[in-house]
Interface confidence: low
Amino acid sequence: IWELKKDVYVVELDWYPDAPGEMVVLTCDTPEEDGITWTLDQSSEVLGSGKTLTIQVKEFGDAGQYTCHKGGEVLSHSLLLLHKKEDGIWSTDILKDQKEPKNKTFLRCEAKNYSGRFTCWWLTTISTDLTFSVKSSRGSSDPQGVTCGAATLSAERVRGDNKEYEYSVECQEDSACPAAEESLPIEVMVDAVHKLKYENYTSSFFIRDIIKPDPPKNLQLKPLKNSRQVEVSWEYPDTWSTPHSYFSLTFCVQVQGKSKREKKDRVFTDKTSATVICRKNASISVRAQDRYYSSSWSEWASVPCS
Amino acid sequence: RAVPGGSSPAWTQCQQLSQKLCTLAWSAHPLVGHMDLREEGDEETTNDVPHIQCGDGCDPQGLRDNSQFCLQRIHQGLIFYEKLLGSDIFTGEPSLLPDSPVGQLHASLLGLSQLLQPEGHHWETQQIPSLSPSQPWQRLLLRFKILRSLQAFVAVAARVFAHGAATLSP
């Protein structure tokens, strides 16, 4: 058993048939010694008396809010949550496996630049009685500070018969060093509580590996005289790290016909302009990637050829 | 070439070669995203590899103030990785394919280090690992880890030289 926060405790249970469970001793937070009784949740049934209560926690029916009273007055509460371990593996029932980039990916994170700011998100089909808390650090044996905000519901989607809820959180490394080569990964830890079930999820990454620039901005076309060619120009996204002479991007320019089956023409360039042939009804798209480290490409920025 | 006493390197040549190093490092190990090497050992996996750290003066401001600190750190790293790529870790079994970019990568690391430090001028270098993994699979894993670490190192070096070429070239 360990304390998650004040008056909230997590009991770690091996979840197998006939498991003996965990013996837990609860102590009433009071100077009183006599006349103390214990109840569980809303029930008025007295579970025991005295300053301490010993219980055997085996299943969710044994978890909940234990309250000690004296003469009708509430003295203190202890909320017991369960963390299940089945076949040696902690349960991951609350969050959905996003399966990208690999199986057992519950948390996904992205950064728009090297400032030490990043966003993580996760999915669940649970809509009520759900709380999350997020902690993060750089490294684990001698952790350096990362500050995370509160997790918020950021999107709702219908997937077949199910509703899916996306939660996200923004974090910022306290003493970020954008130009340095990271040697210790960022660790993100999410505590999830659904009713009386506790689970924790972790992700470990380098900022450089989760970089995904915003799409290039101000994408413009300039027709070239007496030619089917156009000059495409664009700018670095505002959110990208500066100076751009140091934090450079590379770009992919694509000409795509109306039909998805039509052949795509692609040009790669380090410049912020390119000359391409504009076909009728086609569109021109540009996306960006870190020039020196192959993290994710940005989404496309597009303009129609006409 | 960098000259003892702290004159400027050939920023543009260094820029071109460091960008080539980035390309080679990724072609030598393109599967980076698909193999989470940190699962094989937590934050200290490549803990003696020379990293370009916050205090090494490789940020734009530090380069403007005095690029020598940063160039020395980059040189140290280049020599370190050049020795690693020439070691038993890469030359032993399982053999690299004849057209593997590792050979080119090795030569380019040496080339860039020589651009930074002419003969006869010696910056202190970090001691080089003398590990000879006993199992081929260990060697393979170690190669992945080294290449992954090298990708991060050369990315920072390339930024430094790109910025130097754009802002510090005579």
């Epitope: 001698d142 003493s175 | 050992g41 937590d42 003696d48 690992p129 590990l131 170690l142």
Partner: antibody, heavy 114, light 112 residues
Framework: EFQLVQSGAEVKKPGASVKVSCKAS????????MNWVRQAPGQRLEWMGV????????TYNQKFKGRVTITVDTSASTAYMELSSLRSEDTAVYYC???????WGQGTLVTVSS | DIVITQTPLSLPVTPGEPASISCRSS???????????LNWFLQRPGQSPQLLIY???TRASGVPDRFSGSGSGTDLTLKISRVEAEDVGVYYC?????????FGSGTKLEIK
């Protein structure tokens, strides 16, 4: 639980060599550097050197001028410190300590006496 | 090599009273990353050293909050707010700012 268990006490003659072992358990051995520190009777602690078990890279205290060799056997999760050309002033307790110096072995007493 | 000068050599203290140990470094242990690379250890009689404080002021896990570390890059202090009987032993500071790592000469804390 992290543990570093060292080999037993040794008595050596001047000029001989001694090899002390340090077996690690409770963590991934290759993830953390291993330091060696010694303490002569009534003296301050003295850092001898460090090894990165992942690569076998070592850094030594120059005071020991080539007399100290630190090695590892990763398959056995064990680090070794060998000190050669022993003299009476090498009589000390020798400790291994994991990166960060938060975990130490129990110490190995090496006595050098003719 | 960085030389660490530790004072006092011996420190007799009455239980419940505060105690303070100083270490002076021949070179600043404050790095550009803002961290000061100094450890404090307690070595009880017949035992291995135990890490108390790392990075000048961060308590190692399980170390009581009566122990605190402070200082500048070169002048560093370990304070015990109220000495208890279990605190007896030799206290060492250690710099890990550069190789070779070096230790102070030690301060023997004893109960009056």
């Amino acid at each position: 639980e992290f543990q570093l268990v060292q080999s037993g006490a040794e008595v050596k003659k001047p000029g001989a060599s001694v090899k002390v072992s340090c077996k690690a358990s409770g963590y991934t051995f290759t993830d953390h550097n291993m330091n060696w520190v010694r303490q002569a009777p009534g003296q301050r602690l003295e850092w001898m050197g460090v090894i990165n078990p992942n690569y076998g890279t070592t850094t030594y205290n120059q005071k020991f001028k080539g007399r100290v060799t630190i090695t590892v056997d990763t398959s056995a999760s064990t680090a070794y410190m060998e000190l050669s050309s022993l003299r009476s002033e090498d009589t000390a307790v020798y400790y291994c300590a994991r990166r960060g110096f938060a975990y130490w072995g129990q110490g190995t007493l090496v006595t050098v006496s003719s | 090599d960085i030389v660490i000068t530790q004072t006092p050599l011996s420190l007799p203290v009455t239980p419940g009273e505060p105690a303070s140990i100083s270490c002076r470094s021949s070179k600043s242990l404050l790095y550009k990353d803002g961290k000061t690379y100094l450890n404090w250890f307690l070595q009880r009689p017949g035992q291995s050293p135990q890490l108390l404080i790392y990075l000048m002021s961060t308590r190692a896990s399980g170390v009581p909050d009566r122990f605190s570390g402070s200082g500048s890059g070169t002048d560093l202090t370990l304070k015990i707010s109220r000495v208890e009987a279990e605190d007896v032993g030799v206290y060492y500071c250690q710099q890990i700012a550069e190789y070779p790592f070096t230790f102070g000469s030690g301060t023997k804390l004893e109960i009056k």
